[in-house]
Interface confidence: low
């Protein structure tokens, strides 16, 4: 016997109570693929979540976090409190970065300043709680007869720890 359900498109479900007729998904539900025997309930973006994309008959709602929070987890399953630059989130709330560390984002942890001397360079600009140090040319580059000074090392991508 041919399975008529396979002909049901996304946005519908195969209604066994009605001789495998393709019925539209009820309000607040969706089916993202064809041949479904049920529609899934739409996610509701409530509380600390806000709607980024409304639910449709073929796709689930997508949530974001309200102001002051940012998404964590797959499909923004969690919202985590923002902190200021120069801080990190701990169990007791936002705390300033310790000396020698920085955070240039509203999320994530404080990371150690780059150790310029490991690359044979000098510190061109001191680090702060919010910014990494800027490494300048090595002392050898500045000795008499050396070629023009090298430009400062490019800043690391956010989220990358120093090697």
């Amino acid at each position: 016997l041919q399975d008529l359900c396979s002909n049901c498109p996304a946005g519908t479900f195969c209604d066994n109570n009605r001789s495998q007729i393709c019925s539209p998904c009820p309000p607040n539900s969706f089916s993202s693929a064809g041949g479904q025997r049920t529609c899934d309930i739409c996610r509701q973006c409530k509380g600390v979540f806000k709607t980024r994309k409304e639910c449709s008959s073929t796709s689930n709602a997508e949530c974001d976090c309200i102001s002051g929070y940012h998404c964590l987890g797959a499909e923004c399953s969690m919202c985590e409190q923002d902190c200021k630059q120069g801080q990190e989130l701990t169990k007791k709330g936002c705390k300033d970065c310790c000396f020698g560390t920085f955070n240039d984002q509203k999320r994530g942890i404080c990371r150690p300043w780059t150790n310029c001397s490991l690359d044979g360079k000098s510190v061109l600009v001191n680090g702060t709680k919010e910014r990494d140090v800027v490494c300048g040319p090595s002392p050898a580059d500045l000795s008499p007869g050396a070629s023009s000074a090298t430009p400062p090392a490019p800043a690391r991508e956010p989220g990358h720890s120093p090697q």
């Epitope: 509701q44 409530k46 600390v48 949530c63 169990k91």
Partner: nanobody, 124 residues
Amino acid sequence: EVQLLESGGGLVQPGGSLRLSCAASGFTFSSYAMSWGRQAPGKGLEWVSAISGSGGSTYYADSVKGRFTISRDNSKNTLYLHMNSLRAEDTAVYYCAKEKVATTGDYYYDMDVWGQGTTVTVSS
């Protein structure tokens, strides 16, 4: 069955105070973060405040920070929202909500159960 029942709403003059309560049943209250949200007439639901299961961590929307205080009494399975310096723009139906997943951290998952709400009207 999980149930949340809000109470304490009413008519109050600008600058006045109210305390809302939310009686919870049907789940281990202390294991779940809880939230308050509100819906003003003709507007969408706005998150107001949240509190961790232990009560040790609290969070507030900027619009109520310094005026509202969220608290909980885990021995009574009750969530509270103390509202001071009330303004006309605080007029709304206030809902309490339960976190979907029990967690020991300060993360707030999707709230899966919402109460029926209690109406707060701020008017002179």
